[in-house]
């Protein structure tokens, strides 16, 4: 009884198509597959950023796989051939591993790379990224931002930089068609007359960095002798009502402060007849049904009621 063996895949490599972190892992079938013509060979692929605790594992019949990586770190991957038990009259047969690594050949000392990179997708409409120059760079250093997401043919450079003292310190992006709910890749690199500049890579999803506009049209309505309903309207723009959470801050007679988080555009407040003044502000954030994270909007303008009797009044700012 001869032991069944299979070779690992050939020409296993990680290919960088220039998409700032979205890489192709590709390979060729193993040598000497002739004995297994009737078999569907599978491949088990494992890959990770170097330093990561866990491997991502994929089993596929294809000769390629694509995924996103952090190019600030190296990448390692390994693959072996799997012969299913149907092909071997018994147990599954695995080849030895073929291994490969990839990393951007880095340049520059750490004091040259950008600091405090911050990106905000304002009102789910306008993306703006800003950064500080590296601690050790001179005014002759300029930074360039490139970005890519699935749907673009190639990485694009920022065309509208924000500048300070002649240096690029941010980017206003153009309209980004069909760019949410997918990885958005950014590279900030640079040039200087006297030293190489360290590149930095960033990946995020746009829906997770949305900062909405504040709510508008804040109103009061007396519901009963001891209840007031606070109402407001969703911020203007493309974000649907179902995507909002709100935080309210209510101040009664300059003393009691009530804060609450609600999912719709109303809040009912218990009051006493002694209430002389009532003020409230609201802010909005994209909720867990539409994103994994988000940024609170600025507070709305304050809406206040002052007076003797609220029983017959609806107050509209």
């Amino acid at each position: 009884d001869t032991e069944i063996k299979v070779n690992p895949p050939q020409d296993f490599e990680i290919v960088d198509p220039g998409y700032l972190g979205y890489l192709y892992l590709q390979w060729q079938p193993p040598l000497s597959l002739d004995h297994f013509k009737e078999c569907t060979v599978e491949y088990e692929l494992k890959y990770r950023n170097i330093g990561s605790e866990t491997w991502k594992t994929i089993i596929t019949k294809n000769l390629h796989y694509k995924d996103g990586f952090d190019l600030n770190k190296g990448i390692e991957a390994k693959i072996h051939t799997l012969l299913p038990w149907q092909c071997t009259n018994g147990s599954e047969v695995q080849s030895s591993w073929a291994e490969t690594t990839y990393w951007i050949s880095p340049q520059g000392i750490p004091e040259t790379k950008v600091q405090d990179m911050d990106c905000v997708y304002y009102n789910w409409q306008y993306l703006l990224c800003s950064w500080k120059p590296g601690i050790g760079v001179l005014l002759d250093t300029n930074y360039n931002l490139f970005y890519w997401y699935e749907g673009l043919d190639h990485a694009l450079q920022c065309v509208d930089y924000i500048k300070a003292d002649g240096q690029n310190i941010g980017c206003r992006f153009p309209y980004l068609e069909a760019s949410d709910y997918k990885d958005f890749y950014i590279c900030v690199n640079g040039s200087s007359e006297n030293k190489p500049i360290r590149s930095s890579y960033f990946t995020f999803q746009l829906q997770n960095i949305v900062k909405p506009l504040p709510p508008v049209y804040l109103t009061f309505t007396r519901e009963s002798s001891c209840e007031i309903k606070l109402k407001w309207s969703i911020p203007l723009g493309p974000i649907p009502a179902r995507c909002f959470d709100y935080e309210i801050e209510i101040r009664e007679d300059d003393t009691t402060l009530v804060t609450a988080t609600v999912e719709n555009e109303t809040y009912t407040l218990k009051t006493t007849n002694e209430t002389r003044q009532l003020c409230f502000v609201v802010r909005s954030k994209v909720n867990i049904y539409c994103s994994d994270d988000g940024i609170w909007s600025e507070w709305s303008d304050k809406q206040c009621w002052e007076g003797e009797d609220l029983s017959k009044k609806t107050l509209l700012r």
Partner: antibody, heavy 118, light 107 residues
């Protein structure tokens, strides 16, 4: 040629402060950052922080943040480091060091010995 | 912070011996590693940068290798003047961190 000349030894009491200097020559002071490194018992080396003489920007090792202050005087091409609230653990040799465009460190001062003793 | 584990802490070798010192980083430092030699009462002197690039004027018996987390300094044929303490330094990110040093002594 490039030189980094550090101030002389200091003996100070616990709780006091010390300010040491690093006078540079042989290159344009504002074209390179300056780093400070602590060496204890002639063995262990610790990076304290970096200052950009061009704009005064700094980055401190968290361990020294709040107690170390790095400054520069562009007119005399001199870097300074002040250490406050000294304890016996601060007894060490302190070096200023300059990087090259591609690596750390191209040039070192001769070191300032600080002894904290009551 | 990135930790640098250097070994051995000291070694005795004869003139002409091949000497190897290793540094292991707690994470991938992408070859951002320098090696220094320090003699008593003197400031450290850079021998190697970017893991394997020899500084001008440093004898060719010194060489560096490694990538990822593991790095090595080799002295191919130890000379009397090579006595001293050797340190590695990672400069992938702030704060910069040094190895604890290897004291090289001649038998």
């Amino acid at each position: 040629q490039v030189q980094l000349q550090q101030s002389g030894p200091e003996v100070v009491k616990p709780g006091a402060s010390v300010k040491m200097s690093c006078k540079t020559s042989g290159y344009t002071f504002t074209e390179y950052t300056m780093h400070w490194v602590k060496q204890t018992h002639g063995r262990s080396l610790e990076w304290i922080g970096i200052i950009n003489p061009n704009n005064g920007g700094t980055n401190y090792n968290q361990k020294f943040k709040g107690r170390a202050t790095m400054t520069v005087d562009k007119s005399s091409s001199t870097a300074y480091m002040q250490l406050r609230s000294l304890t016996s653990d601060d007894t060490a040799v302190y070096y200023c060091a300059r990087p090259s465009a591609t690596h750390y460190f191209d040039y070192w001062g001769q070191g300032t010995t600080v002894t904290v003793s009551s | 912070d990135i930790q640098m584990t250097q070994s051995p802490s000291s070694l005795y070798a004869s003139v002409g011996d091949r000497v190897t010192i290793t540094c292991k980083a707690s994470q991938d430092i992408k070859s951002y590693l320098s090696w220094y030699q320090q003699k008593p009462g003197k400031a450290p002197k850079t021998l190697i940068y970017r893991a394997n690039r020899l500084v001008d004027g440093v004898p060719s018996r010194f060489s560096g290798s490694g990538s990822g987390q593991d790095y090595t300094l080799t002295i191919s044929s130890l000379q009397y003047e090579d006595m001293g303490i050797y340190y590695c330094l990672q400069y992938d990110e702030f704060p910069l961190t040094f190895g604890a040093g290897t004291k090289v002594e001649i038998k």
